[in-house]
């Protein structure tokens, strides 16, 4: 994300269209308290950050309130009065949606429908990953709303599920972040379990008819 202007690397994360976090890594200024100055509108005067992030006692980032802004963040990272990095960025390019809330599972024979609360903004993908101890890797299914049906499950197997939200790349571009995963939930025969056994139990022998 950060172009190297005087060796400064930046990272921007826009948490759920609520809070912007800008962090910097400036090896040349590693023992310096750089200051962060910003504005959301090209006409305003710059404000200085009031909520700095610190690393080893020195400023390394800033947290800004930016509720639901489809806007450009103009910012300047300064050593005293000297700007060491200045930029303008569309904040939504760095969106990180919040983790899914109110995740629910509705079972019907060999299928489960996973639902959760849709976020208030759009152009998102809701991804469910699942696996049984018999699977070597996670399986995945995603939809435009948090209503994902997974079919062809084995009712006898225990499955682990978790859910996350991703911003559509076609809309927000390649620099967004997926949400954190929801907690892992384990299910077997339509009932919640504490965990799925790490080593799969051997399948029951099929009785010949």
């Amino acid at each position: 994300q950060g172009g190297a202007a005087e060796g400064v690397q930046i990272q921007i994360i826009y948490f759920n269209l609520e809070t912007v976090q800008v962090t910097w890594n400036a090896s040349k200024y590693s023992r310096t308290n750089l200051t962060f100055h910003y504005r959301f509108n090209g006409d305003e005067a710059y404000d200085q950050c009031t909520n700095y992030l610190l690393q080893e006692g020195h400023t390394s980032g800033c947290l800004l309130d930016a509720e639901q802004r489809d806007d450009i963040l103009y910012f300047s990272i300064r050593n005293g009065t000297h700007p060491v990095f200045t930029a303008s960025r569309w904040m939504v390019y760095y969106l990180k949606p919040s983790s899914p809330k109110h995740v629910r599972f509705s079972w019907h024979q060999d299928a489960v429908t996973v639902t959760c609360s849709d976020l208030s903004y759009g152009d998102l993908l809701y991804e469910v990953q699942y696996r049984s101890p018999f699977d070597t890797e996670w399986q995945s299914k995603q939809e435009n709303t948090c209503n994902v049906t997974i079919e062809g499950l084995d009712a006898e197997k225990c499955y682990s599920f978790w859910v996350r939200v991703k911003a559509m790349e076609d809309v927000y571009g390649p620099d967004t972040y997926p949400s954190d995963w929801s907690e892992v939930t384990c299910w077997q025969r339509g009932e919640i379990r504490d965990a799925c056994a790490e080593t799969p139990t051997p399948p029951k022998p099929k009785l010949s008819k």
Partner: antibody, heavy 125, light 106 residues
Framework: EVQLLESGGGLVQPGGSLRLSCAAS????????MNWVRQAPGKGLEWVSG????????YYADSVKGRFTFSRDNSKNTLYLQMISLRAEDTAVYYC??????????????????WGQGTMVTVSS | DIQMTQSPSTLSASVGDRVTITCRAS??????LAWYQQKPGKAPKLLIY???SLESGVPSRFSGSGSGTEFTLTISSLQPDDFATYYC????????FGQGTRLEIK
């Protein structure tokens, strides 16, 4: 057919004012961010200003900030660029241009897929 | 502002040639880059967006690549209609264009 048609250009003295218009047709006008881009004679392209689909957010190049005002009337599918305190260096062909994307990201300005034919603004005494 | 620098400023080539135009950004712009073609007295025409996506209706001989700070526009086999001026444009923040590359007949 998607179309943009600029008007309002002409000759104006330094310090004078002018209002450009851009009439849009063939697409859902209020869903798209729109822009003005200018080109001085024999020179390259310079982005001047952008506006969100709703008109709630406007953006300006430093070279015109405080002198130009970009607005839109979505009921008339029309853009306006009010220019005051004009200078010789504002002499250019002014194009209106449509943002390529329709998304929930309402303010973001991106690539421009439809351009008008341009209107010439000459600032000279 | 982010500076966009195109090279070369002028390029002489012949029909059938493969040509490449480079655009460099003064800061990382990820993939937020577009390419335009402009002919004298005409409005620019969008060719490529998001660094490598071909705009609808644009011939497949045009292609774009790159990310971060270095980008290229390639025309695989020049056609007579391709002699024009080409501009890159970044849109990671406030828009800026490159200074242009004039592609002329050798």
């Amino acid at each position: 057919e998607v179309q943009l048609l600029e008007s309002g250009g002409g000759l104006v003295q330094p310090g004078g004012s002018l209002r450009l218009s851009c009439a849009a047709s063939g697409f859902t006008f209020s869903s798209y961010a729109m822009n003005w881009v200018r080109q001085a004679p024999g020179k390259g392209l310079e982005w001047v200003s952008g506006i969100s689909g709703s008109g709630g957010s406007t953006y300006y190049a430093d070279s015109v900030k405080g002198r130009f005002t970009f607005s839109r009337d979505n009921s008339k599918n029309t853009l306006y660029l009010q220019m005051i305190s004009l200078r010789a260096e504002d002499t250019a062909v002014y194009y209106c241009a449509k943002d390529q994307r329709i998304t929930m990201v309402r303010g973001v300005i991106g690539a421009f897929d439809i351009w008008g034919q341009g209107t010439m603004v000459t600032v000279s005494s | 502002d982010i500076q966009m620098t195109q090279s070369p400023s002028t390029l002489s080539a012949s029909v059938g040639d493969r040509v490449t135009i480079t655009c460099r950004a003064s800061q990382s712009i990820s993939s937020w880059l577009a390419w335009y073609q402009q002919k004298p007295g005409k409005a620019p025409k969008l060719l490529i967006y998001k660094a490598s996506s071909l705009e609808s209706g644009v011939p497949s001989r045009f292609s774009g690549s790159g990310s971060g700070t270095e980008f290229t526009l390639t025309i695989s086999s020049l056609q007579p209609d391709d002699f024009a001026t080409y501009y890159c444009q970044q849109y990671v923040g406030l828009i800026t264009f490159g200074q242009g590359t004039r592609l002329e007949i050798k």
